[in-house]
């Protein structure tokens, strides 16, 4: 017998949709082989209608799809707009139609329940609004208009033009009678409940001349949209609930085993601690739509999510909702990168950020997650060179090592730098990742002077001391700018006004500026790296002043612990949040913008790993 399993019989009605789940043993071969849905013909052959390789038959175009969930050993065939012609015998299977593993499914599409002649069918999701149209003749224009609900053999009055409203519909129903000449009245029911489902009767007038019209109202729970994302990646839930609730509090919740819904985040400031540092709710557009981004996806994030609107910021019956079923694929294309990076006060961290390697030209960004209200993520640095002012001289985004990873270096760390940061690009939004920076006890490994004042026209020598453990690392000095950190040429690259020399015995790498010019003023970094992977850095600010006394100047290592004055300016920052999105590149369907080339002179570096999930910064 076949190990493939599914529903043997599926019964539905015309116009409806079906979602057929087929289960298979999730072996490596099965997970990756072709999945198909085919219809058995009289000849016994099974004609493919839709497959996991993207094929959709003309008969199914625009109304069917097949989604494979290899982690769960499941694939799902969705078919919409069913007609009686869809009734028949089908197979869902793996491999080749004729000799693969398969399961027989019988689909029966019927006409639906017998409804009175001329019945109008309204199919609406729970929480939404329906407008029932009720025509009448001229002679009934002045007479009472009413809507009844048929319950068994009886009719229960729901609303009428004499201001009666059934208590079950209080505050969510209205009857509209148009001006003269229009022979139709409407009944609008808001915030539909499952219990509103059923047959209704419009009536105008009474006696034998009355006008009647039947309406069949189907209230459905929204079909969850299947969302399949990679472990460590990012998911965006786009929630459009309609203008009726544009000014009502919004929420995203996750359905638990008791079938209640735990708030993940809402616009009233509530947020589940399990999503700390990795969730943003983007302010809504004028139409009331909003989106929620979750990064650093974990296996335990799987489940059914609902977004909705209610003044309490949580799920309530009869209010509009949208649903998703999130699956997290453990066979992720997103590489493992440390989720926690540790550094010491005064030291530095080098953060590795993954991006889709197919999008090497995409713009790269790094932002600081802020938990206030719905969360926001102001950009701190981008590959085109913008650096937020208060990070001047201590933050750089490097394109290295490339091929799916870029590097962000932050030095002169303080306890205020602890927090969550997001790596992102203007390309594939699913590759957004989160890293937490922790400031731990310890001393920086690299020692440089604090503020250095150089004299115009003279020689300046700045020492950078490093411990023995870095003796095998490449040492470098670079001049920081907001487009990166330009490595300064070393001595053996020929004569230069600025060169690096290194006395390995004294574990010292020095920067020499000779002669000092006005252009030399600015931030300099001393750093270590291995190939394209960067390690620690230390920063020093060089101020240039007019000559006062003759002679050369050497900065003593004794001054190496003074820190430069830090400028902290609150500049108007772009952020990942959707006030017209201030930077439209940062959300969803962004265009890939050609990069301006390699931004930084240096190469890029790996860091000491404390564990597979943690990356050490400036201290061992």
């Amino acid at each position: 017998k076949s190990p493939v399993f599914g529903p043997q019989e599926v019964s539905s009605v015309e116009g409806n949709s079906v979602s057929i789940k087929c289960y298979y043993p999730p072996t490596s071969v099965n997970r990756h082989t072709r999945k198909y849905w085919c219809r058995k013909g009289a000849s016994g052959r099974c004609i493919t209608l839709v497959s996991s390789e993207g094929y959709v038959s003309s008969n199914y175009a625009g109304r069917a799809n097949l989604t494979n969930f290899p982690e769960n050993g499941t694939f799902v065939v969705n078919i919409a707009q069913l007609s009686r012609d869809d009734s028949g015998h089908y197979k869902c299977g793996l491999g080749i139609n004729s000799r693969g593993l398969s399961f027989d499914v019988s689909l029966e599409v019927s006409q639906g329940p017998e409804l009175p002649n001329g019945t109008e069918v309204y199919t609406v999701d729970v929480g939404r609004t329906v407008t029932i149209k009720c025509p009448f003749k001229t002679e009934n224009a002045p007479k009472t208009k009413a809507l009844y609900k048929k319950i068994g053999q009886t009719s229960v009055l729901v609303i009428d033009s004499r201001n009666y409203v059934n208590p079950n519909y209080k505050d969510r129903i209205r009857l509209r009678i148009p001006g003269t000449g229009q022979l139709i009245f409407t009944v609008v029911i808001d915030r539909l409940r499952l219990s509103d489902h059923g047959l209704y009767l419009c009536q105008a007038g009474d006696g034998s001349n009355r006008d009647e019209k039947n309406a069949d109202l189907q209230v459905l729970e929204p079909e969850p949209e299947l969302v399949y994302e990679d472990l460590r990646g990012s998911v965006t839930f786009h929630c459009a609930l309609g203008l009726e609730v544009a000014n009502v509090a919004k929420f995203l919740c996750r359905v638990n085993s008791r079938e209640t819904c735990d708030v993940v985040i809402n616009t009233l400031g509530k947020r589940d601690s399990a999503f700390e540092g990795r969730i943003l709710l983007n302010p809504q557009d004028k139409d009331g739509s909003f989106s929620v981004v979750i990064t650093g996806l974990r296996k335990e994030d799987e489940g059914r999510y609902l977004c909705g609107a209610h003044s309490d910021g949580q799920l309530q019956e009869g209010w509009p909702i949208q649903a998703w079923q999130l699956f997290v694929n453990e066979e992720s294309t997103i590489p493992r990168s440390p989720t926690v990076v540790k550094g010491v006060a005064g030291g530095s961290v080098a953060v590795l950020c993954p991006y889709n390697p197919k999008e090497s030209q995409s713009l790269k960004y790094w932002c600081l997650w802020e938990g206030a209200q719905n969360g926001r993520c102001p950009l701190l640095v981008e590959s085109q060179g913008l650096v937020q002012e208060q990070y001047e001289g201590r933050l750089s985004l490097l394109q290295e090592p490339g091929n799916g990873t870029f590097t962000v270096i932050l030095n002169q760390l303080t306890t205020q730098d602890a927090g969550f940061y997001w790596c992102l690009t203007n390309g594939d939004t699913r590759w957004r990742t989160t890293v937490e920076i922790k400031i731990i006890e310890g001393e920086p490994n690299l020692k440089v002077p604090g503020n250095v004042t150089a004299v115009l026209g003279e020689t300046l020598n700045i020492p950078c001391h490093f411990p023995c453990k870095f003796s095998s690392y490449e040492k470098y000095w670079c001049k920081w700018s907001n487009t990166g950190c330009q490595t300064l040429p070393s001595q053996d690259e020929g004569p230069s006004e600025a060169f690096v020399n290194c006395d390995e015995n004294s574990r010292l790498v020095s920067l020499t500026l000779n002669p000092v010019t006005r252009a030399d003023e600015g931030w300099y970094w001393c750093g270590v790296k291995q190939g394209h992977f960067y390690g620690e850095t230390a920063a020093v600010y060089v101020a240039v002043e007019e000559k006062k006394v003759a002679g050369s100047r050497y900065v003593s290592p004794a001054k190496a612990d003074a820190a430069p004055d830090e400028k902290v300016l609150d500049s108007g920052v772009r952020e990942i949040e959707n006030k017209a999105i201030q930077d439209p590149r940062l959300f969803a369907e962004e265009k890939v913008v050609a990069d301006t080339g390699d931004q930084a002179g240096g190469s890029r570096a790996s860091v000491d790993s404390s564990s597979s999930e943690e990356q050490g910064g400036s201290s061992k």
């Epitope: 019964s11 009605v13 409806n16 729970e221």
Partner: nanobody, 127 residues
Framework: EVQLVESGGGLVQPGGSLRLSCVAS????????MAWFAQAPGKEREFVAA??????????YYSDSVKGRFTVSGDNAKRTLDLQMKDLNPEDTALYFC??????????????????WGQGTQVTVSS
């Protein structure tokens, strides 16, 4: 509180028929899945048949051992589940449990994918 109550079990001769019924009260949501599992003495609970509803669509699942002999039916609005059992044989002897879940998530054959259970009704097939 959700309650499931089974009925219809009894003693029947091989080749005979029996109809089991289950009523679920208090089951949340408008979609649901209900199933029958059988537990023979000293054995694990085994999947027999299930039916899942969503709107006006129903999905019926059967184990290989009962295909063609047993028919599952029910009414989502009334939260009822029936199992028509024909051509019974002694291997069908077991305690039959009704199970329910508020939605159609997870493989219907796996007992862990059902949140609510009845107390069971005994079916004995013997001459």
């Amino acid at each position: 509180e959700v309650q499931l109550v089974e009925s219809g079990g009894g003693l029947v001769q091989p080749g005979g028929s029996l109809r089991l019924s289950c009523v679920a009260s208090g089951l949340p949501g408008s979609s649901s899945r209900m199933a029958w599992f059988a537990q023979a003495p000293g054995k694990e609970r085994e999947f027999v048949a299930a039916i899942a509803w969503r709107g006006r669509t129903s999905y019926k699942y059967y184990s290989d051992s009962v295909k063609g002999r047993f028919t599952v039916s029910g009414d989502n609005a009334k939260r009822t589940l029936d199992l028509q059992m024909k051509d019974l044989n002694p291997e069908d002897t077991a305690l039959y449990f009704c199970a329910a879940h508020p939605n159609d998530d997870g493989d219907p054959r796996i007992s862990g994918n059902y949140q609510y259970w009845g107390q069971g009704t005994q079916v004995t097939v013997s001459s």
